[in-house]
Interface confidence: medium
């Protein structure tokens, strides 16, 4: 068998809310994979389970069961959503995030996605991680690659 | 030289919409916030809301969210305001005035003001 | 919406000597971020307003010595030292915590 490739594009949208009373923060981060199989046969895409760390905490949970199958020497984009809560210990990131004195609230998360591939029976896992900015202070868009984070974004002059 | 430049005066009848501008100059047009602010003759002042030039995101107050539009032109560094539905109440001076945006906090905000345009509503 | 309070309509003053204007707000303005996020401007007669003060103690550029702020979360002061004839103008306090910004209702500087 050849190899089933598993490409991490990066954030697509961060849709964000507020509890005012609890200080705490609701992002549904929705991340798009490019999963390209290299094989003359059909390959299922079994299940997607992904997670996303804030300051080494797990903050959401996802998984997706029964996604779809590519053909052979195909590639497919797949979307999923995590929904993530910053809330009790962490609730101090609901000043920065509501703070209307700066445009851009970004907070760096690690995102970590595990697809699991099927064919003929056999199963395989291929695991990512990324670390992204997501805008925590507004509904977001990004171009895809737009949101990764190499080293510290510099302010504009 | 920061500079923000709004005409004088504008002489307009009730019920119709003026178009205000402030052509900025200077700085960077799009790494400061654009506000607006009215005011009445003999009164205070009264933010009306702020715009980011580097992608028209608006902040309203209510009071005159549903009359008043705030845009810019990127190509001529200039921020317009829109008030539409015009009474004599409308009758004040109006000032554009730039704050830092972007990744910045607001440091030394509002630290340039327009000269302001005077609108007299009349019939 | 916050409300800002400057209770003092207008506050007379001898050249030379020193004065203070008040302003109170609804809510507090201190951040958990440790600025508090109120200015203070200037409107001189016949002129647009200019900045003076920026997070509550933060002189702006250019603004002469002579002026200070102070205050908790609250309750804000701008003093005037040694007020001189061009200090004539009208003060206003501003918060800029929450959307909408407010300003208080100004104090008038007169002198005696």
């Known amino acids: 068998p050849r190899s089933i490739d598993v490409k991490y594009i990066g954030v697509k949208s961060a849709y964000v809310s507020y509890d005012v009373q609890k200080r705490t923060i609701y992002l549904n981060i929705t991340n798009t994979l490019n999963i390209t199989n290299n094989n003359y046969y059909s390959v299922e895409v079994e299940n997607i389970t992904a997670q996303v760390q804030f300051s080494k905490t797990v903050i959401g949970k996802a998984r997706l069961n029964n996604i779809t199958i590519i053909g052979p020497l195909d590639m497919k984009q797949i979307d999923y959503t995590v929904p993530t809560v910053i809330a009790e210990e962490m609730s101090y990131m609901y000043d920065f995030c509501t703070l209307i004195s700066i445009k851009v609230h970004n907070i760096v998360l690690m995102m970590q996605v595990t697809v699991t591939t099927t064919y003929f029976g056999h199963s395989e896992q291929i695991s990512q991680e990324r670390y992204q900015y997501v805008d925590c202070g507004r509904n977001t868009t990004y171009q895809l690659g737009q949101s990764e984070y190499l080293n510290v974004l510099q302010p504009q002059q | 030289q920061v500079q923000l430049q709004q005409p004088g005066a504008e002489l307009v009848k009730p019920g119709t919409s003026v178009k205000l501008s402030c052509k900025a100059s200077?700085?960077?047009?799009?790494?400061?916030?654009m506000h607006w602010v009215m005011q009445r003759p003999g009164q205070g002042l009264e933010w009306i809301g702020n715009i980011d030039p580097s992608d028209s995101d608006t902040h309203y107050n209510q009071k005159f969210k549903d009359r008043a539009k705030l845009t810019v032109d990127k190509s001529s560094s200039t921020a317009y305001m829109q008030l539409s539905g015009l009474t004599s109440e409308d009758s004040a001076v109006y000032y554009c005035?730039?704050?830092?945006?972007?990744?910045?906090?607001?440091?030394?905000?509002?630290?340039?003001w327009g000269q302001g345009t005077s609108v007299t509503v009349s019939s | 919406d916050i409300v800002m309070t400057q209770a003092a309509p207008s506050v007379p003053v001898t050249p030379g000597e020193s004065v203070s204007i008040s302003c109170r707000s609804s809510k507090s303005l201190l951040h958990t971020n440790g600025n508090t996020y109120l200015f203070w401007f200037i409107q001189r007669p016949g002129q647009s307003p200019h900045l003076l003060i920026y997070r509550k103690s933060n002189l702006a550029s250019g603004v002469p010595d002579r002026f200070s702020g102070s205050g908790s979360g609250t309750a804000f002061t701008l003093r005037i030292s040694r007020v001189e004839a061009e200090d004539v103008g009208v003060y206003y306090c501003?918060?800029?915590?929450?959307?909408?910004?407010?300003f208080g209702s100004g104090t008038k500087l007169e002198i005696k």
């Open positions: 200077g700085s960077t047009f799009t790494n400061y916030w």
């Open positions: 501003m918060q800029h915590l929450e959307y909408p910004f407010t």
């Open positions: 005035a730039r704050s830092r945006g972007g990744y910045y906090d607001y440091g030394e905000a509002m630290d340039y």
